[in-house]
């Protein structure tokens, strides 16, 4: 025998008090799958949370954080304060990145500038608190007499794709 509740679609529940007929989910509740015997209560986006997506009869509300904050954790389960670019959040609040480090986002930690010399390159553009350094050609490429112009790529024969 087929369970009569299996016919109840998402957005309804199988109401045992009414001969297992499919009743709509009450306000502020939802069922995201069919055949449910109860509807789940909707999440409330209150306090530091704000509503990103309203609850419907078939899907839960989704929260994000109020302006000046960003989500952490599964399903936006915590809100953390934004900082400016060039800063990181410490236990004492937002602090400027130390010399030699940068942060180009409103969240996360300051990271060290790229060490161009490790790749045998020179610094083309200095780093700042907000931006990483830009590495340029290797110092050998910039020595007197060395051409800084890239030679043209060899022409490909028509109909041949690059390897």
């Amino acid at each position: 025998l087929q369970d009569p509740c299996s016919n109840c679609p998402a957005g309804t529940f199988c109401d045992n008090n009414r001969n297992q007929i499919c009743s709509p989910c009450p306000p502020n509740s939802f069922s995201s799958a069919g055949g449910q015997r109860t509807c789940d209560i909707c999440r409330q986006c209150k306090g530091v949370f704000r509503t990103r997506k309203e609850c419907s009869s078939t899907s839960n509300a989704e929260c994000d954080c109020t302006p000046g904050f960003h989500c952490l954790g599964a399903g936006c389960s915590m809100c953390e304060q934004d900082c400016k670019q060039g800063q990181e959040l410490t236990k004492k609040g937002c602090k400027d990145c130390c010399f030699g480090t940068f942060n180009d986002q409103k969240r996360g930690i300051c990271r060290p500038w790229t060490n161009c010399s490790l790749d045998g390159k020179s610094v083309l553009v200095n780093g700042t608190k907000e931006r990483d350094v830009v590495c340029g050609p290797s110092p050998a490429d910039l020595s007197p007499g060395a051409s800084s112009v890239t030679p043209p790529a060899p022409a490909r024969e028509p109909g041949h794709s690059p390897q």
């Epitope: 209560i41 999440r43 952490l72 399903g75 304060q81």
Partner: antibody
Amino acid sequence: QVQLQQWGAGLLKPSETLSLTCAVYGGSFSGYYWSWIRQPPGKGLEWIGEINHSGSTDSNPSLKGRVTFSVDTSKNQFSLKLNSVTAADTAVYYCARLTGPFDYWGQGTLVTVSS
Amino acid sequence: EIVMTQSPATLSVSPGERATLSCRASQSISSILAWYQQKPGQAPRLLIYGASTRATGIPARFSGSGSGTEFTLTISSLQSEDFAVYYCQQYYNWPLTFGGGTKVEIK
């Protein structure tokens, strides 16, 4: 380091008004919600309510409108008033920062209601 | 309101052993759950949020799991400083509610 420091009267008579204040040191004050939680001796934790820097509040219906919250952004402080106290309001009262969970807490203030 | 129920009320464990604490919600709360540790005379301390994410500075021996209505806090190898009372708390719906606590004591 974010620190929450709280103070207020520790001994009250029935029908009096409980009054506590919490000061926030370090970190940001605006944008967050700031809460009060209490814990009767030897028992569990009960959320009382919350307020943000602009004065928006929410409270536990179990306190039946006896509770009032206020905020002083110039001092980074927020306060709780609970009127018509009874012996059932005897508890350690905590202030805390609400970021979803409560991530920073005050040291707690024991409030005893006794005639 | 959502009722949070913790079990057992008291858990007796030897140092170095594993401790498993349970928390049940009266209705589904997705993963919007926190765990706190409280030692005598101290305020609670946040351990876990979002059911499974460790808060800043919390040792890896603490782990959280679960979603919906059933949640677990596991302490993989109990240290002397871990003997305390542990509370779960939902922040899926207002009013915010806590479980009654589990006391982890030395066996």
